[in-house]
């Protein structure tokens, strides 16, 4: 277990021409607020999975009304960290989304209206218990500074917070096979207390006897990798005759969503569906009112007026989930043509188009011979997303400019000789064989296997193939 | 702008059938893939059928053999036919359209049509 930490620095105009608008004016006094979503693994950041690490909202910022003709400055930030606190292991590689809100205060009809000011994303590398990174985003005009850290929560230590620390039982020194906890180096590492077996790189324990594991994987030990198992009953008992794996308890036994909330099984873990009044990741986030900007994405927060009665967040299209924290999954009517692989970002869909396609939505079948010539009177051939170039005889190689060998494949049978010539190849046959390769033999009578030798040339005269 | 418009909607019994109908209005626009989203009350909303970019339709297995996609190009309109309706059938349907603008793509959303499968 631990917490995620992250630091607002600034928030303000990025460098270079087009400084953005202000987002507050003396009309429309407004203040900022940041919401910061985890994700594990290096995911694409814009897929728009449950933010399974966790997130977290800031405090309000001081309000701020712009100065008449000023540039916008960077802006008053809210006081301290933005804390996402993390259950289990710490992944080491993580995705994260930093969304900058804006609230307005002026005189809107049923209170305060949020409107998202800008949105980063990146992936990153992060072992627990290490110094602060320092980090830089722009996002259009705006650019945001901040700082990040993970670190373990004691008694767990580690990179991955899965090491335990326990106090030392003797003053000098720890146990046997036993290490001093850095940097708690008047701590010593608690012995291995998971259960027998349980797998070093895929399991963690947090009690003794206990083996939990880490995301895609199962089993008791957390051998067994998650997958569409092939067997009739999904939790029914191991065949050993189809060498079924049965993955251990699904990520919804027990029902880990708190509060009233449904579990549905994913590919990967599980979600929660929240009642209203409740979210995080297991629904354990309550007590929540609309001036605790719960809707996201620009959804709209009706009721809620106190922490005793439920708000209803309105979404805007494409967004769903009790806080419009999930994107409809548009990518599921496969926009993208030609086998083109689709990424929904959010504001736009995006298409990675294979070889030899191009277009927003791969729908231009690139021309492969388009502005390509083939040398030395090639010719161009177009196909399968490259283009490929028909070579005339004497020249190879991709775009016909290498002067080829024609004896570099040994054309000349039974021991004939081949010599380079400027229109091909000429083979000097070994006694007994003629032809343009030396291929028919010549009979022991003087006939040969051909009707008749050309004109002018007798068997063992070099051949030109033409 | 785009506009799609959805009817259709209403309420049968299990074993029963709807014809909805989805039509896209605009100047200028052409529809690169469109099809039938539905949400049931407190579930997440999930394509249920659709045209490709490529053309090819496209169906939610839990409707397969039971629904069928149509369109009609002159119109610009698409059609999905639910026989052998069941109680978790029931859902607003969304018709969802990518659509070409321009020289730009752009989503647009129905406000959608509600399908009730009751006894």
């Known amino acids: 277990a631990g917490v995620f930490e992250l630091q607002i620095h600034s928030f303000g105009p990025g460098p270079g021409p087009g400084a953005p608008r202000s987002p507050c004016s003396a009309r429309l006094p407004c203040r900022l607020f940041f919401r910061v979503c985890l994700k594990p693994g290096l995911s694409e950041e814009a897929a728009e999975s449950p933010c399974a690490l966790g997130a977290a909202l800031s405090a309000r910022g001081p309000v701020y009304t712009e100065q008449p003709g000023a540039p916008a400055p960077d802006l008053p930030l809210p006081d301290g960290l933005l804390q996402v606190p993390f259950r289990d292991a710490w992944p080491g590689t993580f995705s994260f989304i930093i969304e900058t809100w804006r609230e307005e205060l002026g005189d809107q009809i049923g209170g305060p209206a949020w409107s998202l000011l800008a949105r980063v994303a990146g992936r990153r590398r992060l072992a627990a218990g290490g110094p602060w990174a320092r980090d830089i985003q722009r996002a259009g005009a705006w650019e945001l500074r901040f700082s990040y850290r993970a670190r373990c929560e004691p008694p767990a230590v580690g990179t991955a917070c899965t090491r335990l620390c326990r106090p030392r039982s003797a003053p000098s020194r720890c146990g046997p096979g036993l290490r001093p906890c850095a940097p708690l180096e008047d701590e010593c590492e608690a012995p291995l207390v998971c259960r027998a077996g349980c797998s070093p790189e895929h399991g963690f324990c947090e009690q003794p006897g206990e083996c939990r594991c880490l995301e895609g994987w199962t089993g008791p030990l957390c051998t067994v990798p998650v997958s569409t198992s092939s067997c009739l009953s999904p939790r029914g008992p191991s065949s050993a005759t189809t060498g079924c794996l049965v993955p251990g308890p699904g990520p919804c036994d027990g029902n880990p969503c708190a509060n009233g909330g449904s579990c549905s099984e994913t590919p990967r873990s599980f979600e929660c569906t929240c009642p209203r009044g409740f979210y995080g990741l297991r629904c354990e986030v309550s007590g929540v009112t609309c001036a605790d900007g719960p809707c996201f994405n620009g959804g709209l927060c009706v009721g809620g007026a106190d922490p005793d009665s439920a708000y209803i967040c309105h979404c805007p299209p494409g967004f769903q989930g009790s806080n419009c924290e999930k994107r409809v999954d548009r990518c599921s009517l496969q926009p993208c043509r030609n086998g083109g692989l689709c990424l929904d970002l959010g504001h736009a869909l995006r298409c990675r188009c294979r070889a030899g396609f191009a277009g927003p939505r791969c729908e231009h079948d690139l021309d492969d011979c388009a502005g390509r010539a083939c040398a030395n009177g090639g010719t161009c051939v177009e196909g399968g997303g490259a283009h490929r170039c028909s070579c005339a005889l004497g020249f190879g190689g991709r775009d016909c400019r290498e002067r080829a060998d024609p004896c570099a494949a040994r054309p000349c049978a039974h021991g004939g000789r081949c010599y380079a010539h400027f229109s091909g190849l000429v083979c000097a046959c070994a006694p007994g064989y003629m032809g343009a390769r030396c291929e028919f033999p010549v009979h022991p009578d003087g006939a040969s296997a051909l009707p008749a030798a050309p004109p002018g040339l007798r068997p063992g005269d070099p051949q030109r193939y033409l | 702008e785009v506009q799609l418009v959805e009817s259709g909607g209403g309420e049968v019994q299990p074993g029963g059938s709807l014809r909805l109908s989805c039509a896209a209005s605009?100047?200028?626009?052409?529809?690169?893939?469109i099809g039938w989203y539905r949400q049931a009350p407190g579930k997440q909303r999930d394509m249920v059928a659709g045209f490709t970019g490529d053309g090819v339709t496209t169906y939610a297995e839990s409707v397969k053999g039971r629904f069928t996609i149509s369109r009609d190009n002159a119109k610009n309109t698409v059609y999905l036919q639910m026989s052998s309706l069941r109680a978790e059938d029931t859902a607003v349907y969304y018709c969802a359209a990518d659509v070409k603008i321009g020289g730009d793509y752009e989503w647009f959303w129905g406000q959608g049509t509600l399908v009730t499968v009751k006894p």
């Open positions: 605009g100047s200028d626009f052409s529809i690169n893939a």
